[in-house]
């Protein structure tokens, strides 16, 4: 016929067939994969399908029932005797629910022509499937040439054995896809051209990438694209209590599979990932950064009583430096070093100790040496200042010994060895140190520097001076060497326990050179620089108390 208009639309009721036990095979397949959304499944329709056949003696509905006596809508045609068959079966309108590419799964049996008696030359082993797009739910009364052919359907395995009753019937399954679709819905049509077919099931579906949580991002149900090779980029949204610095995306393939994940979400500070969700850190646990994987137990000497903690609070008397990460244990300043001993020689003091009994919980203990110089008479101590050198260093000392070079001789020192760590400066408590008192050995004194002239006469010169800056012991005596200028090889030595002398027997109006040195038990110091003084002329007056520059 040139037109399908006015198709026979009375319900198609054929004989009530027995349960063919194809039912079992069908029903086990009723559950579609999660990425397939059925638009029509003839197996699940309980009432009339509303399909129509034209002509009316072509396709017929046969009332199959399954093992639960639920109907199976089966359509059969076996017009193999006559040539030029053109039997149409039209579905009702099928909404595409926004899908632009749909799939049609047919389950059918198609009888091998050789199994029919008499070798019918008119018998065919294929049928045709068509579709027609329409926004109109009542638009199937159209000319058959408006239907677009999807494909010619042939059995992958046409059969001669019909396993029915206590046997298993062989069902052929063929799937075709159609797209892109542009209207709200469509009709399907099945054209028989002279085959012996039973159409047992028609399932129309589209594919979607099902809603999924991946990398803590929720990706919504996404209908696949119209093109079989198309990948749709879909943005995910982070689950509750998660954040991202690399927005999550995935690609939905035409087969309904999520591919090529990009980016991810991370549970924010105070939350950790469990079963695809972000769960709060329990009291006693914390997570400082989204980049951390799990909530961690509070580090030693810290605690938290709240949920969702991003850090833990230090216990009393314990501290954490500002630069320390929250994962670091809280520590306290170390106790004092122990068992400090000293060793003194002429040029240095060597100190040694053992580490404190309590390091405060950290491994960053270092030592600070404070040097005090004490006046033995007054009992007053002052910081040593720069005259002592520390080897290897005074501050941040890692080993448990130090050497002080260039100490003053015959001096009382107090060395305070303090153990410190990163939190020592945060603690309001008193310093923890061990003291070592050291008296250095006597040494040769330093040179005399300050010499003043006293009474100068024609035959004598009186001088006075101050004790050397560094006596380095008890001054036993001074030695004064003098000679007439330019007569250095002919000198005179005077010894004096005082800091004054008078040189006599000198020539009038002559220049004399004086040098003074002090002696301790350790020996003489070096001579002072040369001081020049001139005797008066025979008739000159004496000159008192002028300091020699």
């Amino acid at each position: 016929p040139a037109s399908l208009a006015g198709c026979y639309s009375a319900p198609l009721k054929g004989p009530l067939w027995t349960c063919l036990l194809l039912c079992a095979a069908l029903r086990t397949l009723l559950a579609s994969p999660s990425n397939e959304v059925n638009l029509l499944d003839s197996r699940t329709v309980l009432g009339d399908l509303g399909w129509i056949a034209f002509p009316k003696n072509g396709w017929e509905e046969i009332g199959e029932v399954d093992e639960n006596y639920a109907p199976i809508h089966t359509y059969q045609v076996c017009k193999v005797m006559e040539q030029n068959q053109n039997n149409w079966l039209l579905t009702s309108w099928i909404s595409n629910e926004g899908a632009s590419r749909i799939f049609i799964e047919l389950k059918f049996t198609l009888r091998d022509c050789n199994s029919l008696p008499g070798g019918l030359g008119t018998c065919k082993e294929t049928f045709n499937m068509y579709y027609f797009e329409s926004d109109d739910e009542n638009g199937r009364n159209i000319k058959d040439n408006q239907y677009i052919k999807i494909d010619t359907i042939a059995a992958d395995e046409s059969f001669t054995e019909l396993d029915l009753g206590d046997r298993v019937m062989k069902l052929n399954t063929e799937v075709r896809d159609v797209g892109p679709l542009s209207k709200k819905g469509f009709y399907l049509a099945f054209q028989d051209v002279g085959a012996c077919i039973a159409l047992v099931s028609v399932r129309v579906y589209y594919k979607k990438c099902p809603s999924v949580v991946r990398h803590l991002a929720v990706f919504p149900d996404t209908i696949t694209g119209a093109d079989s090779s198309q990948l749709l980029e879909v943005s995910g949204s982070c689950v509750n209590h998660s954040v991202t610095d690399d927005p999550p995306k995935m690609h939905c393939s035409a087969e309904g599979e999520w591919l090529v994940p990009i980016g991810k979400c991370m549970c924010k500070a105070g939350y950790e990932e469990k079963n695809g969700t972000c769960q709060v850190c329990r009291p006693g646990f914390f997570k400082a950064s989204p980049h951390s994987q799990t909530c961690s137990k509070c580090p030693p000497h810290s605690y938290t009583h709240e949920e969702a903690s991003t850090s833990c609070v230090c216990e009393k008397d314990y501290f954490r430096r500002e630069s320390d990460p929250p994962t670091m244990a809280c520590t306290r300043p170390p106790s004092a070093p122990r068992n400090a001993i000293s060793n003194v020689n002429e040029t240095s003091v060597f100190l040694e100790w053992i580490p404190p009994a309590d390091t405060g919980g950290g491994k960053d203990v270092s030592y600070y040496i404070l040097c005090k110089k004490c006046n033995s008479h007054a009992g007053v101590c002052e910081e040593c200042g720069g005259h002592v050198r520390y080897l290897p260093q005074q501050i941040g000392l890692k080993n448990t010994s130090v050497m002080m070079a260039d100490p003053l001789a015959h001096t009382n020192y107090t060395f305070e060895i303090e153990a410190v760590n990163g939190v020592s400066d945060l603690s309001p408590g008193t310093r923890q140190y061990v003291s070592v008192n050291v008296t250095t050995n006597q040494a040769a004194p330093s040179p005399v520097t300050n010499v003043k002239k006293g009474k100068i006469a024609k035959n004598s010169i009186s001088l006075s001076w101050q004790e050397p800056d560094r006596p380095n012991g008890i001054i036993l005596e001074y030695e004064i060497k003098y000679f007439e200028k330019d007569q250095e090889t002919s000198y005179t030595i005077i010894k004096s326990k005082e800091t004054t002398i008078t040189a006599e027997g000198l020539k009038p109006a002559s220049v004399y050179v004086f040098q003074i040195r002090a002696r301790t038990a350790a020996g003489y110091g070096v001579f002072s620089r040369r001081f020049e003084f001139e005797t008066t002329p025979v008739f000159g007056a004496s000159n008192d108390q002028s300091q020699i520059p």
Partner: antibody, heavy 121, light 106 residues
């Protein structure tokens, strides 16, 4: 109503011929093959063969070639069985039966009432 | 030619009882087997085709099974109108009938 109507009983002498008609009604005659079955008195059923009502192509069972001819007149939706050179052993009831071909199998689903052909001298 | 052998030749049953008829083929006919019922003076009636599919209008007390060479027709509860001769017929290769089984009242 689908039915096959056969003629009444025939009595023939040996060597004669007989033509048994089978008129179909209630369906499209050319959509179904027509089969012929013989049942001798007190005996079982014997399939004689069938004719494709669309092409007129006959198929004969073993033992039913030569003297037996299937034919059609589609204009009156009638199939015919002609037996020539009748013998006494041809005495039997001859049935025509419509052949229903389905995906699930074949069967003779509509039968004529039968025509008794008696061959006697 | 495929030979069909039916057994028993005669089956005596009481109304309401179960009747089981057998048909054996000399070679495999797959599922290409039909069963017919014939009452005296009447034409045969198609009961089953495709080895197990009931024909239109056949009560569900008639069931059949089998494949290959061994087939069974079962009448679950025999009714008075079921007393008749039953024939099996194969259409796997040419067409042949079995010799029939008579179901009679016991």
């Amino acid at each position: 109503q689908v039915q096959l109507l056969q003629s009444g009983a025939e009595v023939k002498k040996p060597g004669a011929s007989v033509k048994v008609p089978c008129k179909a009604s209630g369906y499209t005659f050319t959509s179904y093959a027509m089969s012929w079955v013989r049942q001798a008195p007190g005996q079982g059923l014997e399939w004689m063969g069938w004719i494709n009502t669309n092409t007129g192509n006959p198929t004969y069972a073993q033992g039913f070639t030569g003297r037996f001819v299937f034919s059609l007149d589609t204009s009156v939706s009638t199939a015919y069985l002609q037996i020539s050179s009748l013998k006494a052993e041809d005495t039997a009831v001859y049935y025509c039966a419509r052949v229903r071909l389905t995906v699930y199998g074949d069967g003779m689903d509509v039968w004529g009432q039968g025509t008794l052909v008696t061959v006697s001298s | 030619e495929i030979v069909l052998t039916q057994s028993p030749a005669t089956l005596s049953v009481s109304p309401g009882e179960r009747a089981t008829l057998s048909c054996r083929a000399s070679q495999s006919v797959s599922s290409n087997l039909a069963w017919y019922q014939q009452k005296p003076g009447q034409a045969p009636r198609l009961l089953i085709y495709g080895a197990s599919t009931r024909a239109t209008g056949i009560p569900d007390r008639f069931s059949a099974s089998g494949s290959g060479t061994d087939f069974t027709l079962t009448i679950s509860r025999v009714e008075p109108e079921d007393f008749a001769v039953y024939y099996c017929q194969q259409y796997g290769s040419s067409w042949t009938f079995g010799q029939g089984t008579k179901v009679e009242i016991k």
